[in-house]
Amino acid sequence: QRFAQAQQQLPLESLGWDVAELQLNHTGPQQDPRLYWQGGPALGRSFLHGPELDKGQLRIHRDGIYMVHIQVTLAICSSTTASRHHPTTLAVGICSPASRSISLLRLSFHQGCTIASQRLTPLARGDTLCTNLTGTLLPSRNTDETFFGVQWVRP
Amino acid sequence: QRFAQAQQQLPLESLGWDVAELQLNHTGPQQDPRLYWQGGPALGRSFLHGPELDKGQLRIHRDGIYMVHIQVTLAICSSTTASRHHPTTLAVGICSPASRSISLLRLSFHQGCTIASQRLTPLARGDTLCTNLTGTLLPSRNTDETFFGVQWVRP
Amino acid sequence: QRFAQAQQQLPLESLGWDVAELQLNHTGPQQDPRLYWQGGPALGRSFLHGPELDKGQLRIHRDGIYMVHIQVTLAICSSTTASRHHPTTLAVGICSPASRSISLLRLSFHQGCTIASQRLTPLARGDTLCTNLTGTLLPSRNTDETFFGVQWVRP
């Protein structure tokens, strides 16, 4: 019982429970394929506990293995639209620091209007994750259709 | 070593390890779009450790941030069937208490016969999650094709 | 603070933090639908902390409930290719020991070129997970397009 109390008294950060769930804020200007994210209780059900946002991109604060997940739905989309605008592709990667730049997760829409996936990956403090949407279709800003998050899993 | 032993002796519930994985029981009557779930070792690989089922809907017992995931496959489905019956949509949301009602996760099938996604979301004790399937196609009841689960991640 | 230090000093294995993320190595010979996986820091961002590879298949070392996730993308694929080669199906299951053989997760590609899903499932020490891809299309070996992983969640 004493242990359980002790566990409660520890700041969660010391347990490494970094977690974030973001909602889409806006897309970038024409030559910038990045999606810009936002999070926080004032916005609804999005939040950042540990990681931070840097100009709409997610920056990691704790080394470890993370579960990264994303769902993106295209706005005003049908299977005909999606196939006509193929290739529309989403890629999640480390975009900074440049020395660690790598694509972590990539999906194409083909004849669908939603992609959703997740993966485990090592991330380091200071890594910034970017989500690039290439193509001519807009992502939905509905919070139940487009979201992006990370969860610290272990050191 | 003593700490590891102490940890083992604590009930898992005190660590907040609430988790559930459910299989489809049945669909609702005609005007009810909800899917009705079931879980327990007697049924196979489904289980509830913490959350409970209330008339086939999942009720949360511990406040926290949860990873919610779902996969639904349509029965006797081809891409032709799926596109013909568009829109077939799945939505996961808090349906009770009414004051907290919100859609958490939404996907359309378009030309596919399976949707799968996951997200992090804050849930509170007493929240009931409903999964609404709108359209005229039946969800598969095969346990490897249709399932729904939650995992407590942090307070 | 003392607790935090104690926690750090404990081997992670004693906390049950088994986790693995694998990348595709190769497909099997003609009559073998299994995908063969590889993992380790020398290969990039794949890793095994607890589970092991046995002839390219993932073997579990710790009893518990696991989150299993997978993404497979077909190589040189368009929606036309995918529909023409239907059914192309991916199944993840316990393939050994034979007494515990079961399909855990199954998806068809239909008119898409990528499948991605995840589920919670109980696994036991010694369970070997196999991923069977049936059809006449090759999976992509790009590490951001095809991957397979497990994460221990609780006892």
């Epitope: - | 005609q30 029965a75 006797i76 013909r84 019956h85 196609l137 039946l138 009841r141 346990t143 | -």
Partner: antibody, heavy 120, light 111 residues
């Protein structure tokens, strides 16, 4: 409650064609396959084909070897079944039918039936 | 095509007694956790009436003396206590694939 109302009885000569209509009440007409089933006097039920009014896509029973044509008019919520090259064994009651909720080929709603008599 | 075979072709049962009709499919009509087998009742001069869908799902308004069971290839329609108004021809039908096919029918009479 959906109602399916079919056109009246027909008497036809061998070698000719017949076109039977089926008007559906309600606004769900485009979303459900409309099936056609026939029953010869004193015999069992035989599925002929189906049309999905939303797109006009059809499926046919190969036993009819291209003699049956299904069409639909969304504006009037009416489905049509045309059977050509009639012979005496085509004498039967022809039913339109559809499901009530799930769009699979079992039939909650049936038309009242249209008797087609083929006789010289 | 899947061939549906009903037995018996005709059946005479006393009022209040149990009536059982069997249907066998030439291959499994089960898929996705369902059995795509359905039962109809047809009275003279009327279209068929759906009694049971998906092997065991009693349709709205159908008396609960009717029940269905079975999976794979073998199915049964049971009337637990025969009533006079149950005299009719009963058909099984599958919808597992196209074309859907019907059994030849079983004529149920009162003994």
């Amino acid at each position: 409650e959906v109602q399916l109302v079919q056109s009246g009885a027909e008497v036809k000569k061998p070698g000719s064609s017949v076109k039977v209509s089926c008007k559906a009440s309600g606004d769900t007409f485009p979303r459900y396959n409309m099936h056609w089933v026939r029953q010869a006097p004193g015999q069992g039920l035989e599925w002929m084909g189906a049309i999905f009014p939303g797109t006009g896509e059809t499926s046919y029973n190969q036993n009819f070897k291209g003699r049956v044509t299904l069409t639909a008019d969304k504006s009037t919520s009416t489905a049509y079944m045309e059977l050509s090259s009639l012979r005496s064994e085509d004498t039967a009651v022809y039913y339109c039918a559809r499901n009530s909720y799930y769009d699979y080929a079992w039939f909650t709603y049936w038309g009242q039936g249209t008797l087609v008599t083929v006789s010289s | 095509d899947i061939v549906m075979t009903q037995s018996p072709d005709s059946l005479a049962v006393s009022l209040g007694e149990r009536a059982t009709i069997n249907c066998r499919a030439s291959k499994s009509v089960s898929s996705s956790g369902y059995s795509f087998m359905h039962w109809y009742q047809q009275k003279p001069g009327q279209p068929p009436k759906l009694l049971i869908s998906l092997a065991d799902n009693l349709e709205s308004g159908v008396p609960d003396r009717f029940s269905g069971s079975g999976s794979g290839t073998d199915f049964t329609l049971t009337i637990s206590s025969l009533q006079a108004e149950d005299v009719a021809v009963y058909y099984c039908q599958h919808s597992r694939e196209f074309p859907p096919t019907f059994g030849q029918g079983t004529k149920l009479e009162i003994k």
